[in-house]
Interface confidence: low
């Protein structure tokens, strides 16, 4: 249904509060370096304009597209060229090229200061003094650091952020109440951002078909009682929502997400028995709850898949006449029977099935040719099963920190050209798979682990894309979305790598390490470990372990010393010399 004024339509649908929040998120995700006050000014101007359009949809400029209105507004920023360089050239373009240009300049790793959490009393005072500004600042700081954060979900995070301060700032022990809640929001927020980043990468790098295949598999696992036509409808709608959000169309995205939640709840009888509680919640909580809802029980007595997809005489006819629908049905039927498989495994199986039909339906005896197609699935299923078993055993033996270190060494040897901060960040996140997934029973381990690893490896891919340094990373990231993890797993030590020159400065530490949190101290040690491997890629596990144990003892000793700085200087030199000797540097 066409509206005379798109901006008035969205303002009315979303309400002023959500409209303003979403415009702020959109602007902060595009112009990540702009000061908060500048963005607030732009948002207020857009909001006032929207109100004039609500009053009179025929008013001047009210018929313009949202991209035109928002782009024009962004291009009024005076310091655009000084702050953003070539991004300013986007403003010379017409829509839709201008918006595409802005999208291409989104920076996954913006050069912004780390967010430092002030004292609890300071935060509570700021919250009470001006709640609206305090919450806007939260949206702004998250959005500019996470330019692909799922905007309607960020509204949900902001609601929880507000609730935490409302409750805890009047508690007897404010810090004990607030800090765990803020930690939880921070960790969940990072996870949410990374998951959405994979969805956007899937759409932008591999196309709508790839995203739809992912969605068919995931929704079929989650809603195994829903009929194929129902799943297809949900996939179509979900694809539209994520295409909009990934494309910067945040108002449309939030509006369509609300419509999808409404549809799901109105039709929950034909979708899933697990939706009842979600559907009783307010909008933001409802949408979040639906997105996280547990898998429904599988229908009893599902017939064998072989009947329709191997034994039927219609296989090639069905495939030829409607390839994507037939493959979609295969994926739906396989996924609803296998909540124990990762989505990426299900997509690999569907790809194998598709490749087999492409080959066999052109053969003299198609049925004879594809009769054993399900046998080809066995090694594909066993590979992630074995990998997860081995890595969970290693995790249980080492614990999270040492398991992360094992992965740091493994990945630095595979792709030593990648920057040390990226290797540390990615390997630490890869290592978290242990505590996240190994606690689960066998039936839940693979979907937990492999789909989580897909999210983490996508972080490596988007960070590497900004500054490509390794052909091996580029190859694994671009060849196949569903085979990224097997591609990285298969990489051996890079024999072409020329070891990094030894630089004593890299291994010089100061007393400030003693005041760091345990997490920050781990990151310092892990950074040193990556640098060691880059200097000595052929170092054995035993050699590296000995050096790292010495390093841990050195930090502990000097942090207990009276004159810490002198200890770090003197003992540090000894440690470097001993390490060089141990590693033959």
């Amino acid at each position: 249904d066409a509206h005379k004024s798109e901006v008035a339509h969205r303002f009315k649908d979303l309400g002023e509060e959500n409209f303003k929040a979403l415009v702020l998120i959109a602007f902060a995700q595009y112009l990540q370096q702009c000061p908060f006050e500048d963005h607030v000014k732009l948002v207020n101007e857009v909001t006032e304009f929207a109100k004039t359009c609500v009053a009179d949809e025929s008013a001047e400029n009210c018929d313009k597209s949202l991209h035109t209105l928002f782009g024009d507004k962004l291009c009024t920023v005076a310091t655009l060229r000084e702050t953003y360089g070539e991004m300013a050239d986007c403003c010379a373009k017409q829509e839709p090229e201008r918006n595409e240009c802005f999208l291409q300049h989104k920076d996954d790793n913006p050069n912004l200061p780390r967010l430092v959490r002030p004292e609890v009393d300071v935060m509570c005072t700021a919250f009470h003094d001006n709640e609206e500004t305090f919450l806007k600042k939260y949206l702004y700081e998250i959005a500019r650091r996470h330019p692909y954060f799922y905007a309607p979900e960020l509204l949900f995070f902001a609601k929880r952020y507000k609730a935490a301060f409302t409750e805890c700032c009047q508690a007897a022990d404010k810090a004990a109440c607030l800090l765990p809640k803020l930690d939880e929001l921070r960790d969940e927020g990072k996870a949410s951002s990374a998951k959405q980043r994979l969805k956007c990468a899937s759409l932008q790098k591999f196309g709508e078909r790839a995203f739809k295949a992912w969605a068919v598999a995931r929704l079929s696992q989650r809603f195994p009682k829903a009929e194929f036509a129902e799943v297809s409808k949900l996939v179509t709608d979900l694809t539209k929502v994520h295409t909009e959000c990934c494309h910067g169309d945040l108002l449309e995205c939030a509006d369509d997400r609300a419509d999808l939640a409404k549809y799901i709840c109105e039709n929950q009888d034909s979708i899933s028995s697990k939706l009842k509680e979600c559907c009783e919640k307010p909008l933001l909580e409802k949408s979040h709850c639906i997105a996280e809802v547990e898998n429904d029980e599988m229908p009893a007595d599902l017939p064998s898949l072989a009947a329709d997809f191997v034994e039927s005489k219609d296989v090639c006819k069905n495939y030829a006449e409607a390839k994507d629908v037939f493959l979609g049905m295969f994926l739906y039927e396989y996924a609803r029977r296998h909540p124990d498989y990762s989505v990426v495994l299900l997509l690999r199986l569907a790809k194998t099935y598709e490749t087999t039909l492409e080959k066999c339906c052109a053969a003299a005896d198609p049925h004879e040719c594809y009769a054993k197609v399900f046998d080809e699935f066995k090694p594909l299923v066993e590979e992630p099963q074995n990998l997860i078993k081995q890595n969970c055993e290693l995790f249980e033996q080492l614990g999270e920190y040492k398991f992360q270190n094992a992965l740091l060494v493994r990945y630095t040897k595979k792709v030593p050209q990648v920057s040390t901060p990226t290797l540390v960040e990615v390997s630490r996140n890869l290592g978290k798979v242990g505590s996240k997934c190994c606690k689960h029973p066998e039936a839940k381990r693979m979907p937990c682990a492999e789909d989580y690893l897909s999210v983490v490896l996508n972080q490596l891919c988007v960070l590497h894309e900004k500054t490509p340094v390794s052909d091996r990373v580029t190859k694994c990231c671009t060849e196949s979305l569903v085979n990224r993890r097997p591609c990285f797993s298969a990489l051996e030590v890079d024999e072409t790598y020329v070891p990094k020159e030894f630089n004593a400065e890299t291994f010089t530490f100061h007393a400030d390490i003693c005041t760091l949190s345990e997490k920050e101290r781990q990151i310092k040690k892990q950074t040193a470990l990556v640098e060691l491997v880059k200097h000595k890629p052929k170092a054995t596990k035993e050699q590296l372990k000995a050096v790292m144990d010495d390093f841990a003892a050195f930090v502990e000793k000097c942090c207990k010393a009276d004159d810490k700085e002198t200890c770090f200087a003197e003992e540090g030199k000894k440690l470097v010399a001993a390490s060089q000797a141990a590693l033959g540097l």
């Epitope: 219609d314 006449e321 629908v325």
Partner: nanobody
Framework: EVQLVESGGGLVQPGGSLRLSCAAS????????MSWVRQAPGKGPEWVSA????????RYAESVKGRFTISRDNAKKTLYLQMNSLKPEDTAVYYC????????GSQGTQVTVSS
Amino acid sequence: EVQLVESGGGLVQPGGSLRLSCAASGFTFGSFGMSWVRQAPGKGPEWVSAIDSGGADTRYAESVKGRFTISRDNAKKTLYLQMNSLKPEDTAVYYCTIGRSASRGSQGTQVTVSS
């Protein structure tokens, strides 16, 4: 977008007949086997009958064998279920589905057999 719209249900006395229809759109109807599934109040979905893409091969649940007949018109993109000698235990919402899944579709059509 794949859509299936069932019609033809209603209230009928035991021993009576009804003919259900299912209009399909959004996919190549003639390429797919189709089924009828029903769900009685408070019960799970129950597979009733299936037909292959060409209409030659038909299957029935034991409970409806000899009373129900499944058919299709690929030109009209429509699936049918002729139900004779209806019994009170046939009371349910009837859904058509693609393939041979025992899962229920979107809207369905209510069939009530009662005197």
